[in-house]
Interface confidence: medium
């Protein structure tokens, strides 16, 4: 999906009002220095591409993020403020339903959400410092 047509200010508002808090809740009890940020983005569409990938694509050791509150709110924000996004996500939704039904917070998931926090911070204020 091409994120260049999204309403970035509206997505930023959604992040500041709710998504950021849900990410903090998920990470509660984890030290902010525990994980190194290895994923970066250079502008807002690039950030959203990385955010979508980390949030909705199951990875080894962490298959359950899509059902988390921050993920559902992220999906809603993208669906509302990125024209045509919902239509591109039909296959992804089917894959999500096949994913594990139980929520399991693994260390790998915590690391992934830590990366997401960094990406969202960059989206909120694009740092443009790394390619």
């Amino acid at each position: 999906y091409d994120f260049t047509n999204c309403d970035f200010e509206k997505i930023k508002a959604a992040y500041l009002s709710t998504i950021s808090k849900d990410l903090i809740t998920y990470m509660s009890g984890t030290k902010s220095t525990e994980f190194n940020n290895t994923v970066s983005c250079s502008n807002r569409p690039h950030c959203l591409t990385e955010i979508q990938s980390l949030t909705f694509n199951p990875t080894a050791g962490c298959a359950s993020l899509a059902k988390e509150m921050f993920a559902m709110k992220t999906k809603a924000a993208l669906a509302i403020w990125c024209p045509g996004y919902s239509e591109t996500q039909i296959n992804a939704t089917q894959a999500m339903k096949k994913a594990r039904k139980s929520k399991v917070t693994t260390n790998k998931c915590l690391e992934q959400v830590s990366q997401l926090q960094g990406l969202w911070r960059r989206f909120n204020r694009p740092l443009l410092k790394q390619q």
Partner: antibody, heavy 117, light 107 residues
Framework: EVQLVQSGAEVKKPGASVKVSCKAS????????MHWVKQAPGQGLEWMGM????????TLIQKFKDKVTMTVDKSTSTAYMELSSLRSEDTAVYYC??????????WGQGTTVTVSS | DIQMTQSPSSLSASVGDRVTITCRAS??????LAWYQQKPGKAPKLLVY???TLAEGVPSRFSGSVSGTDFTLTISSLQPEDFATYYC?????????FGGGTKVEIK
């Protein structure tokens, strides 16, 4: 209305330094990055580096690291770019330009720096 | 660093002509490319960003497109005020680089 107003033309001798200013108005100064672009006479555009006005963090390309110092004064919404140890090849028009996503929606009018003995 | 190869370096055209300028990136920069117009003695002016989004106030005769690492700026019907130099610039990440420029002259 967003405006970036740069200081006037400068003529300097080799070895001297020059400080170019770029005063921003019409937007929140600390929200956007300030980049500097060089254009030598009859040449194309060359990206020099950038500064984050919110924390003064700078990124310069290698060839300008020993030549350029970028600073900001948040109280006056002004960005500065200082060129040291001037040589003839530093003769150029220097532009400031603001950005959020890497493209430049507003530019200063340019400052001509001439290095001549 | 990402290299931007712009062509042609110059072209001659008449008012009303359709003009196409291309820019090729040395690696994938997705849609992160901008186009600028510069007139002598003036600062560059943003025309297109994210490869195909027209900047505010830019006439609709300008358009941008992308195919892989090849980017195109098209002026559908050249106007007298369009004679200028055009630059592409990737905005994928540091360091930003510009194409060498295309000078559009009157035939």
């Amino acid at each position: 209305e967003v405006q970036l107003v740069q200081s006037g033309a400068e003529v300097k001798k080799p070895g001297a330094s020059v400080k170019v200013s770029c005063k921003a108005s019409g937007y929140t100064f600390t929200t956007y990055w300030m980049h500097w672009v060089k254009q030598a006479p009859g040449q194309g555009l060359e990206w020099m580096g950038m500064i984050d006005p919110s924390d003064s963090e700078t990124t310069l390309i290698q060839k300008f690291k020993d030549k350029v110092t970028m600073t900001v004064d948040k109280s006056t919404s002004t960005a500065y770019m200082e060129l040291s140890s001037l040589r003839s090849e530093d003769t150029a028009v220097y532009y400031c330009a603001r950005t959020l996503d890497g493209y430049y929606d507003y530019w200063g009018q340019g400052t001509t720096v001439t290095v001549s003995s | 660093d990402i290299q931007m190869t712009q062509s042609p370096s110059s072209l001659s055209a008449s008012v009303g002509d359709r003009v196409t300028i291309t820019c090729r990136a040395s690696e994938n920069i997705y849609s992160y490319l901008a186009w600028y117009q510069q007139k002598p003695g003036k600062a560059p002016k943003l025309l297109v960003y994210f490869a195909k989004t027209l900047a505010e106030g830019v006439p609709s005769r300008f358009s941008g497109s992308v195919s892989g690492t090849d980017f195109t700026l098209t002026i559908s019907s050249l106007q007298p005020e369009d004679f200028a130099t055009y630059y592409c610039q990737h905005h994928y990440g540091t360091p930003w680089t510009f194409g060498g420029g295309t000078k559009v002259e009157i035939k």
